[in-house]
Interface confidence: medium
């Protein structure tokens, strides 16, 4: 289970039209459910139940986004429509280039994602928890546009903001 280095990039424009980017670094883990490789894309927050619908019309997203899913306590969803692995597969089928699960409230999902799969996904499936998950969800919940950059080695530059 390798460390996944995740950079969340925010973009801020001003009336003059110039942009500043703000980068927040956090760490997660690559799960065995997916590949250990880098990925980048715009964050799309997905509700776990939103991944249940198998309707083709629900395929709303363009290819190349990073799905962020906050898993709920198992008691709140005792008979899930899909396993956690199934949800990751569904997101990738819909065009996700990577999936990040916040497992803080459902730590059992870690074992589910790390069970040796005969057919692992070809895209990374990362899980985060604790302070890193709080940091991620705080950005995802409050900001309009954010990009996630997932790497399997530490980013070269410090995670401070820089002008573009």
């Amino acid at each position: 289970k390798e460390t996944a280095f995740v950079e969340v990039v925010l973009f801020e424009s001003s009336p003059s039209g110039d942009y500043t980017t703000y980068t927040t670094g956090l760490t997660g883990r690559f799960s065995r459910a997916g590949a250990t490789l880098s990925a980048e894309g715009e964050i799309v927050q997905m509700h776990p139940l939103g991944l249940c619908n198998n309707n083709d019309e629900e395929d709303l997203y363009e290819y190349g986004w990073v799905g962020v899913v906050k898993l709920e306590q198992p008691e709140l969803d005792p008979k899930p429509c899909l396993t956690v692995l199934g949800k990751a597969k569904r997101a990738v089928q819909r065009g996700a280039t990577a999936v990040i699960f916040d497992v803080s409230e459902n730590p059992e999902a870690i074992d589910q994602l790390n069970q040796g799969s005969e057919d692992p996904l070809k895209r990374p499936v990362v899980y985060v928890k604790g302070a890193d998950a709080i940091k991620l969800m705080n950005i995802v919940n409050k900001q309009k546009v954010a990009r996630a950059r997932i790497q399997h080695r530490p980013p070269r530059q410090p995670t401070e903001y820089f002008d573009m």
Partner: antibody
Framework: QVQLVQSGAEVKKPGASVKVSCKAS????????MHWVRQAPGQGLEWMGW????????RYAQNLQGRVTMTRDTSTSTVYMELSSLRSEDTAVYYC????????????????WGQGTLVTVSS | DIVMTQSPLSLPVTPGEPASISCRSS???????????LDWYLQKPGQSPQLLIY???NRASGVPDRFSGSGSGTDFTLKISRVEAEDVGVYYC?????????FGQGTKLEIK
């Protein structure tokens, strides 16, 4: 010029669902987020959520989570807001409002607004 | 979540006189880029809201220069230098820093 044209007034019974449309014209539809804001009779403005027409990504106000769904049809440049399990307190004028252009993570700015759609929930 | 509070809630004004509306946020709206993420909207009777001021002090396109916005951090003010009959309506401040977006309760400006 930029225009947002909303669907007509609706009368619904408690427990039913309503789907309001907002057709955009005069600009590149996929480049601008769309928000929904509602206003109960004689009350102030309440933000309901947004949809990114490019990715389809959404963000909803916490108090509406699970009851509201925002979708879009890029072929007709139309966004939709569906509210389910309606109750009397959902009686309001529902507005769509276009956000500003660009990749700004925050700095939300609503301009222009649709003409509004009155949804009445009554038994 | 950020909470917005406006005062007064009702503002009777004589045409030609100045008017001032206050808006306070529960946390600072000053972004690290130096801009205050606070907008003002006007909803005229029977109409949809319209953008007046964005980022604290920038007038939206077509807004007369008698309207001005000021303030920083948590305290903001909308001023109308000389009120005209067409300015009647409800004025709302809105924090545009982060979701969930929040409006003030509104200030109803009416002509005396």
């Amino acid at each position: 010029q930029v225009q947002l044209v909303q669907s007509g007034a609706e009368v619904k019974k408690p427990g039913a669902s309503v789907k309001v449309s907002c057709k955009a014209s005069g600009y590149t539809f996929s480049r601008y987020f769309m928000h929904w804001v509602r206003q109960a009779p004689g009350q102030g403005l309440e933000w309901m959520g947004w949809i990114n027409p490019n990715s389809g990504g959404t963000r909803y106000a916490q108090n509406l989570q699970g009851r509201v769904t925002m979708t879009r049809d890029t072929s007709t440049s139309t966004v939709y807001m569906e509210l389910s399990s309606l109750r009397s307190e959902d009686t309001a004028v529902y507005y769509c409002a276009r956000d500003q252009k660009g990749k700004s993570s925050s700095w939300f700015r609503f301009d222009p607004w649709g003409q509004g759609t009155l949804v009445t929930v009554s038994s | 979540d950020i909470v917005m509070t406006q005062s007064p809630l009702s503002l009777p004004v004589t045409p030609g006189e100045p008017a001032s509306i206050s808006c306070r946020s529960s946390q600072s709206l000053l972004h690290s880029n130096g801009y205050n993420y606070l907008d003002w909207y006007l909803q005229k009777p029977g109409q949809s809201p319209q953008l007046l001021i964005y980022l604290g002090s920038n007038r939206a396109s077509g807004v007369p220069d008698r309207f001005s916005g000021s303030g920083s951090g948590t305290d903001f003010t909308l001023k109308i230098s000389r009120v005209e009959a067409e300015d009647v309506g409800v004025y709302y401040c809105m924090q545009s820093l982060e979701a969930p977006l929040a409006f003030g309760q509104g200030t109803k400006l009416e002509i005396k």
